[in-house]
């Protein structure tokens, strides 16, 4: 392992693109640690404000975590010659609040990208597609990790955060080859309905620890080879027949539903029936009712139709204010 000498300076690394020389095959940027044998470069917790320009050509795994990057501009990793081997890029926890269109262009082998734990007030629709064409060149990405990228309320744009993320995922149909998508802990209230239709190769989808109340307008039908669907720790009240039928029709899926506030009234009957016969739900014997109060902590699998009633709705003439 070679480690760049940081001389006497501990100031943030400031790359100057204008003066950048073509990188030597074995050089290591200042404030980074490099291992050619492992094809790995780590520039971790060094308060970098820009991506180093002089990354070695051999880099396959690049860790730029725990920095102060703020903005990732177009072509942030474009080099001449290109970083043709770079397969895994981890930018988590680097205080990014803006990822611009084309930020990951000219990385032909990039399979895994982790942007987690960055408060992304702005994620360009073309962050992953690289162009504004209606159909872009396919992205090589196979795994995209976007956990906890929601910015604080005061930094949010006018448009919905869900919509901003969705636009980046569907732009140019560039992510048709994506197998893994993690969107946990983003305060999502809903999943934009067109997103999953544009990601037909998804095998693993993590939507855990959001605020999803309903999946009524979400279709999983196109995700023919979905294997893992993580919906734990949301605000789901019930899964309706359409969703249940779609999930049952996916031959490889395992669904994770723990820690949702299930409402055990008459609308829950179909879901209970389905749970009793399905093999797709992991830990289904742990699912319990949260509401109404009289049903709290009852195990869903132990309920029968007589348990699942709804209070009669009074006709308007009998309702009191």
């Amino acid at each position: 392992t070679s480690s760049a000498s940081s001389s006497s300076s501990s100031a943030p690394f400031l790359a100057s693109a204008a003066s950048a020389q073509p990188p030597l095959p074995d050089q290591c940027p200042a404030l980074c640690e490099c291992s050619e044998a492992a094809r790995t470069v780590k520039c971790v917790n060094r308060n970098l404000t820009e991506v180093p320009t002089d990354l070695p050509l051999y880099v396959r795994n690049l860790f730029l975590t725990g920095n102060q990057l703020a903005v990732l501009p177009a072509g942030a990793f474009a080099r001449r010659p290109p970083l043709a081997e770079l397969a895994a890029l981890n930018l988590s926890g680097s205080r990014l609040d803006e990822v611009r269109g084309g930020a990951f262009e000219h990385l032909p082998s990039l399979r895994q990208l982790d942007l987690s734990h960055n408060p992304l007030a702005y994620l360009s629709p073309f962050a992953f597609s690289g162009s504004n064409a209606s159909i872009s060149a396919p992205s090589p990405l196979v795994e995209l990790i976007l956990n906890h990228i929601v910015p604080p309320d005061d930094k949010r744009q006018n448009r919905s955060f869900e919509g901003m993320v969705a636009a980046a995922l569907v732009a140019g149909r560039a992510l048709q080859g994506l197998h893994l998508l993690e969107l946990a802990s983003n305060h999502f209230l809903y999943l934009p309905r067109d997103v999953l239709a544009q990601l037909p190769s998804l095998r693993y989808l993590d939507l855990s620890n959001n605020s999803l109340v309903s999946l009524t307008y979400v279709s999983f039908r196109n995700l023919t080879h979905l294997e893992s669907l993580h919906l734990e720790d949301n605000a789901l009240k019930v899964l309706h027949n359409g969703t249940l039928a779609e999930l049952q029709g996916l031959p490889h899926v395992r669904v994770f539903l723990d820690n949702n506030p299930w409402v055990c009234d008459c609308h829950m009957a179909d879901m209970v029936t389905w749970l009793k016969q399905t093999g797709v739900v992991q830990g289904k014997d742990r699912l319990t009712c949260a509401f109404p109060e009289k049903m709290r902590n009852r195990v869903l699998l132990e309920l029968n139709s007589a348990d699942l009633d709804c209070d009669p709705i009074l006709p308007p003439s009998l309702q009191t204010s």
Partner: antibody, heavy 115, light 107 residues
Framework: EVQLQQSGPELVKPGASVKISCKAS????????MNWVKQRPGKGLEWIGR????????NYNGKFKGKATLTADKSSTTAYMQLTSLTSEDSAVYFC????????WGQGTSVTVSS | DIQMTQSTSSLSASLGDRVTISCRAS??????LNWYQQKPDGTVKLLIY???RLHSGVPSRFSGSGSGTDYSLTISNLEQEDIATYFC?????????FGGGTKLEIK
């Protein structure tokens, strides 16, 4: 691309058991499903079963229930298949295959049952 | 169990030919049909999944089609390296089942 490395050939006596392994590595997304497939010499392919490595959930072909037991070590991305009460009918090459659609296959492990 | 039938167990063709291999399921499998190639050395590779989706790294001369119970694999321009046995497999209903295989040889 995912690589699956299977354990080496086995020569075992009738009535004995054997446990073969399959380790996944590589840069592509590695599925949670690991399938096992049997191929007798000069014959076709038979699906034995599969294990979901995240939670150990299994599906078996009824024909192999009681014969094969699938397990997995999530931390080391290794899957195992144990075959018990072996007879000459169990002499075959056994493949592991990763993915719902069996996207990537191991090189096969030859099991020969002979006294 | 769903039976998968590959009616042609062996097939001879010339290099450059267009070759079609067929597969029939005993009931509707809703396009959950995969094609695998097994080389003479025993190595197995996925070619096509979900009837027509090309697996990564597979040459575009391979294509798949079909619906319901009838499916086919086409090699548009046969090359020497395509000499192998081809298996269809359904993953719509457990247990997954394979066809008996079609061995492709050079004339």
């Amino acid at each position: 691309e995912v690589q699956l490395q299977q354990s080496g050939p086995e020569l075992v006596k009738p009535g004995a058991s054997v446990k073969i392994s399959c380790k996944a590595s590589g840069y592509a997304f590695s599925s949670s499903w690991m399938n096992w497939v049997k191929q007798r010499p000069g014959k076709g392919l038979e699906w034995i079963g599969r294990i979901y490595r995240e939670d150990g959930h299994t599906n078996y072909n009824g024909k192999f229930k009681g014969k094969a037991t699938l397990t997995a070590d999530k931390s080391s991305t290794t899957a195992y298949m144990q075959l018990t009460s072996l007879t000459s009918e169990d002499s075959a090459v056994y493949f592991c295959a990763n993915g719902g659609a069996m996207d990537y296959w191991g090189q096969g492990t030859s099991v020969t049952v002979s006294s | 169990d769903i039976q998968m039938t590959q009616s042609t167990s062996s097939l001879s063709a010339s290099l450059g030919d267009r070759v079609t291999i067929s597969c029939r399921a005993s009931q509707d499998i809703s396009n959950y049909l995969n094609w695998y190639q097994q080389k003479p050395d025993g190595t197995v590779k996925l070619l096509i999944y979900y009837t027509s989706r090309l697996h990564s790294g597979v040459p575009s001369r391979f294509s798949g089609s079909g619906s319901g119970t009838d499916y086919s694999l086409t090699i548009s321009n046969l090359e020497q390296e395509d000499i192998a046995t081809y298996f269809c497999q359904q993953d719509n209903t457990l247990p997954w089942t394979f066809g008996g295989g079609t061995k492709l040889e050079i004339k």
